[in-house]
Interface confidence: medium
């Protein structure tokens, strides 16, 4: 999606199915404010931003309103009337789901099941990582739906959990997004803990889907 | 299950419009798009154009001037109307639903619908 | 738009054979391909989306492969329930466009 034309690399993602961001940057036209010109039906006049992002006082995106969208975003990036990038991508391509909402933990001796609010949209992945300040890295489980028991966990050890959504390779493409992790949270023998002891900082999330 | 059902005309006449109803059940359209595309011996299979979920149309430009496809969400009803049909419009049309989003392949197809343009 | 070609209009094989048929684009579909079968009563299924991926319900002795412009899907073990017509299906480009299909019969 990074093509460049005239020296112009976008960027697009479609935060859970409702705005979509496009920023961009273009060296050449560092010190000017481009204007960005969208359509989304192929036949019809292309509309001008109203919401633009702005780095260093100049434009370098554009957020967009696109409820529940699976169509093509047609755009024009233009310095006055003269286009610098213009083309026409797939937003669901670069869908981002939201980050897990209302994570509750529910505790059954050496198993936990982790749930949250399904998104309003299927063909997703709910996953729940895991450590203790025993392990080397993460373990990872994940499910369909925003509900992931993990089992053989060790009552008296102290676990730290966060949780993330993805969208599914083979539904919407190679080339999504997973969702913002949510906050990690730490228990021990059933309750809530402010931390693990000698828990290393939690990596930052992989983009590998 | 996922099905799609076709109701419309066996025969129209030259210079008069064809208008096909595809009513879906087992999903929603809201969630996914439906595509229709026709079948005739001397053209194979053409996609004709698709609905998307949020209700905007893409249309092939060979046929953009004359087909109108639209849809009542609550009703689960897609509707294709074709203007100004002559004789090598005759051709089976099939609706067909959207799958995979990233992948735009037409999951699962209506019966057929087939038309004959004669007088 | 992009013309899909499937050079084999019609194919002849035994049961228990395994059988390739071809497609070509007009420039490179990115593996953008998808496989569908007609039955001979005229009903249309898919059978792979992007290249090599099987639709749910689909079995496994239906395959595919190739990059670029050029495509193939592959029945390991033909049987019976296999005979009918395949099509190509370009999901690039709008419009999309299909090959002219590959009917398939028993020697």
């Known amino acids: 999606q990074g093509g460049a034309a005239e020296g112009v690399q976008i960027q697009i993602i479609y935060f859970n199915l409702e705005t979509v961001q496009v920023t961009w940057n273009a060296s050449k036209y560092s010190r000017t404010n481009l204007t960005f010109h969208y359509r989304f039906n192929g036949d019809e006049a292309y509309d001008q931003c109203t919401n633009y992002l702005l780095q260093e006082g100049h434009t370098s995106g554009c957020l967009l309103d696109a409820e529940q969208r699976d169509d093509i975003l047609y755009f024009s990036i233009r310095n006055g009337t003269h286009p610098v990038f213009t083309a026409s991508r797939w937003m669901v391509y670069y869908l981002k789901p939201s980050s897990p909402k209302h994570v509750r933990f529910s505790w059954h001796q050496d198993a936990v099941t982790v749930t949250c609010s399904d998104l309003s949209y299927g063909d997703l992945l709910y996953e729940v990582q895991y450590r203790s300040p025993f392990d080397t890295e993460w373990q990872s489980k994940q499910e369909n739906t925003c509900n992931v028991t993990i089992e053989g966990l060790d009552a008296e050890k102290c676990y730290s959990f966060w949780v993330r959504v993805k969208a599914m390779e083979d539904v919407y493409g190679p080339d999504t997004y997973p969702s913002d992790w949510s906050e990690v949270t730490c228990w021990q023998r059933g309750e809530i803990r402010d931390a693990c002891a000698e828990t290393p900082t939690p990596p930052k999330p992989k983009l590998s889907k | 299950q996922v099905q799609l059902k076709q109701s419309g005309p066996g025969l129209v006449q030259p210079s008069q419009s064809l208008s096909i109803t595809c009513t879906v059940s087992?999903?929603?359209?809201?969630?996914?798009?439906v595509h229709w595309v026709r079948q005739s011996p001397g053209k194979g299979l053409e996609w004709l154009g698709v609905?998307?979920?949020?209700?905007?149309?893409a249309y092939n430009p060979a046929f953009m001037s004359r087909l109108s496809i639209t849809k009542d969400n609550s009703k689960s009803q897609v509707f294709f109307k074709m203007n100004s049909l002559q004789a090598d419009d005759t051709a089976i049309y099939h609706c067909?639903?959207?799958?995979?989003?990233?992948?735009?392949?037409?999951?699962?197809w209506g019966q057929g619908t087939s038309v004959t343009v004669s007088s | 738009d992009i013309q899909m070609t499937q050079t084999t209009s019609s194919l002849s094989a035994s049961l228990g054979d395994r059988v390739t048929i071809n497609c070509r684009a007009s420039?490179?579909?990115?593996?953008?391909l998808n496989w569908y079968q007609q039955n001979p009563d005229g009903t249309v299924k898919l059978l792979i989306y992007y290249t090599s991926r099987l639709h749910s319900g689909v079995p496994s002795r239906f395959s595919g492969s190739g990059s670029g412009t050029d495509y193939s899907l592959t029945i390991s073990n033909l049987e019976q329930e296999d005979i009918a017509t395949y099509f190509c299906?370009?999901?690039?480009?709008?419009?999309?466009?299909f090959g002219g299909g590959t009917k398939l019969e028993i020697k």
């Open positions: 420039q490179d579909i990115s593996n953008y």
């Open positions: 299906q370009q999901a690039n480009t709008l419009p999309w466009t």
């Open positions: 067909a639903k959207k799958s995979y989003y990233g992948y735009h392949a037409m999951g699962y």
């Open positions: 609905i998307w979920r949020g209700g905007n149309t």
């Open positions: 087992g999903f929603s359209l809201t969630t996914y798009g």
